[in-house]
């Protein structure tokens, strides 16, 4: 599965937009990458 | 203006140790994530570690090739990254570069050092 | 890890010709593929990651295309400037890898 920042960041934004949560701004998961590489 | 400056490159013989360092300016450096990207003479680009911001825990990873002899490391407060090399071996003859990044997640931004040589030869 | 296969290896061309560098993934990596451009010399310049989004100071003649595993970088109409040899790269998953690289050179 997708293993950058990008891509659990994407995945969690839809899970909270579904169940009513907020991504904040400035989050980032610790555990992978970066598609800004 | 934005610089990253690679520094701590020369010969050293197979087996030996040697640290490289990168200062970065012109950009808010605590921020970026950064990795070492090297590249044998006459040969492509290979990636060879990377160490997240503070507010990502520092966290680090490594390719395999180097996994377990070299370790990478930022000093926040001295905007630098430093990369400790133990056990080198002829194949870590390279250039070594820096690369900074960072999402926005609408842009980013990239930035790469100019480089230092690192021979490991007897 | 991910291996990304470039072709052709050494590409031939006119300044004002169209020049296509091929990028192929082992495994599917989405869009999370870059392109760079390196010199001479040089360090490495960045010209579109994500796989199709050109960065900051980057000519419109550059673009970039595909998903999954097959990615294209296109330059419309070469400039003197642009013979060089041009990677890709991939940030799906670690380690982060390269392809073996593109020479485009004057024909």
């Known amino acids: 599965s997708c293993n950058t920042a990008t891509c659990v960041t994407h995945r969690l934004a839809g899970l909270l937009s579904r169940s009513g949560g907020v991504v904040k701004d400035n989050f980032v998961p610790t555990n992978v990458g970066s598609e800004a590489f | 203006e934005v610089q990253l400056v690679e520094s701590g490159g020369g010969l050293v013989q197979p087996g030996g140790s040697l640290r490289l360092s990168c200062a970065a300016s012109?950009?808010?450096?605590?921020?970026?994530?950064i990795s070492w990207v090297r590249q044998a003479p006459g040969k492509g680009l290979e990636w060879v570690a990377e160490?997240?911001?503070?507010?990502?825990?520092?966290?680090?990873h490594y390719a395999e090739a180097v996994k377990g002899r070299f370790t990478i490391s930022r000093d926040n407060a001295k905007n630098s990254l430093y990369l400790q090399m133990n056990s080198l071996r002829a194949e870590d003859t390279a250039v070594y570069y820096c690369?900074?990044?960072?999402?926005?997640?609408?842009?980013?931004?990239?930035?790469w050092g100019q480089g230092t040589l690192v021979t490991v030869s007897s | 890890e991910i291996v990304l296969t470039q072709s052709p290896a050494t590409l031939s061309l006119s300044p004002g010709e169209r020049a296509t560098l091929s990028c192929k993934a082992s495994?599917?990596?989405?869009?999370?593929v870059s392109w760079y451009q390196q010199k001479p010399g040089q360090a490495p310049r960045l010209l579109i990651y994500?796989?199709?989004n050109r960065y900051l100071g980057i000519p419109a003649r550059f673009s970039g295309s595909g998903s999954g595993t097959d990615f294209t970088l296109t330059i419309s109409s070469l400039e003197p400037e642009d013979f060089a040899v041009y990677y890709c790269s991939q940030s799906y998953n670690y380690p982060y890898t390269f392809g073996q690289g593109t020479k485009l050179e004057i024909k």
């Open positions: 690369v900074g990044y960072f999402d926005y997640g609408l842009a980013i931004q990239n930035y």
């Open positions: 012109g950009f808010t450096f605590s921020n970026y994530w």
């Open positions: 994500g796989a199709s």
């Open positions: 160490i997240r911001s503070e507010s990502d825990a520092s966290a680090t």
């Open positions: 495994k599917r990596v989405t869009t999370y």
